[in-house]
Interface confidence: medium
Amino acid sequence: GLECDGKVNICCKKQFFVSFKDIGWNDWIIAPSGYHANYCEGECPSHIAGTSGSSLSFHSTVINHYRMRGHSPFANLKSCCVPTKLRPMSMLYYDDGQNIIKKDIQNMIVEECGCS
Amino acid sequence: GLECDGKVNICCKKQFFVSFKDIGWNDWIIAPSGYHANYCEGECPSHIAGTSGSSLSFHSTVINHYRMRGHSPFANLKSCCVPTKLRPMSMLYYDDGQNIIKKDIQNMIVEECGCS
């Protein structure tokens, strides 16, 4: 997956820091105070649809075969720049009973972006 | 994740059968001859962005907090209807040396769709 460098407008991963205070979650998250969540942005022209990233690979490649051949309904189906690989992160937070929980939370950080 | 029923235009899972013969893969895939790959289609209005499906959950919810508050650059970032849960499927195929391989191939079947 591409890293966005400002030079390309093709689907890429953009760095982004999330502050838990900003989104009002500091009432239950103890640590960290925020993290690099990142996000995906950019164009997905038809020739790269289904070719980047990992997790959507087989399925998106199959669908792209139909799309490239103008097969209805895929010809008009827009390919999207989305997370294709996400990583977990460890968090310290309060449960409802104000007990402190330490847990690896799935799908927190975008590692790779690709065209769906 | 919603199943498309023709009544809604909100992001949903649409049934779709892939024929390996149609896409010219029957020269290396022995079985099955095709499968229900399914795909995602539909609108992702801002109020449902990041709210459906499972695998993008934490990350998309976090990003959606910023989007809903008109935070740049997310205000203009289009939310997409994409697979959020994929399922593997067992396949019988030839490898490059014409050996017959039986393997569970990841991410073949779309189980759920959601807004990124």
Epitope: D27, W28 | T51, T61
Partner: antibody
């Protein structure tokens, strides 16, 4: 201080629908599990289903499938339960309950709404 | 569905005396992570239920230490070391190992 405030009592005709709301205040909304539990007069507690806004996943007990719709509006921190095709046996107090953050369906319910009495009568 | 069976149905108690309620599940509530997904709730007359014990043996915040939970797998017990007048109500066990979440039929505790 977390508070769950439910909508008021309802009297409904058989065959109609009812939509009960549960507005949360004093905390975050999306990472928690929001369940609906009902209690018929003089009976025990019965889980109907719930929703986890952070993942958008909803779950409904088989008994209510096709009749119950559970939704959540993050912008107003409100969970909703709509029950359709009402019959007299649906006369009960309906409670919303909040399960711990990021605990999925394996949640314990520390906070409960005050309950909403729904009476189904012709 | 997991069936939860409570006993006794009714429990007349004397203030200051101990009390014990049993809860049995139709399948083990012990997860591979080591937790028993069983909670105990008390519903006082005219009130909403309140959490007493979670994950089999952990007392919820603000719950007096006279309440304790024990057991593992399919057999669980809620004990009140010395019953007080304010403890009257219906006690429910609840399993959260798998959906649908299910409750026991309840045990009504009343003062003799």
């Amino acid at each position: 201080q977390v508070q769950l405030v439910q909508s008021g009592a309802e009297v409904k005709k058989p065959g109609s629908s009812v939509k009960v709301s549960c507005k949360a205040s004093g905390g975050s909304f999306s990472p928690y599990t929001w369940s609906w539990v009902r209690q018929a007069p003089g009976q025990g507690l019965e889980w109907m289903g719930g929703i986890i806004p952070i993942s958008g996943t909803a779950n409904t007990a088989q008994k209510f499938q096709g009749r119950v719709t559970i939704t959540a509006d993050e912008s107003t921190s409100t969970a909703y339960m709509e029950l359709s095709s009402l019959r007299s046996e649906d006369t009960a107090v309906y409670y919303c309950a909040r399960g711990g953050p990021l605990s999925g369906w394996r949640a314990s319910y520390y906070y409960w709404g005050q309950g909403t009495l729904v009476t189904v009568s012709s | 569905d997991i069936v939860m069976t409570q006993s006794p149905l009714s429990l007349p108690v004397t203030p200051g005396e101990p009390a014990s309620i049993s809860c049995r599940s139709s399948q083990s509530l012990l997860h591979s992570n080591g937790y028993n997904y069983l909670d105990w709730y008390l519903q006082k007359p005219g009130q909403s239920p309140q959490l007493l014990i979670y994950l089999g043996s952990n007392r919820a915040s603000g719950v007096p230490d006279r309440f304790s939970g024990s057991g593992s797998g399919t057999d669980f017990t809620l004990k009140i070391s010395r019953v007080e007048a304010e403890d009257v109500g219906v006690y429910y066990c609840m399993q959260a190992l798998q959906t649908p979440i299910t409750f026991g039929g309840g045990t009504k505790v009343e003062i003799k």
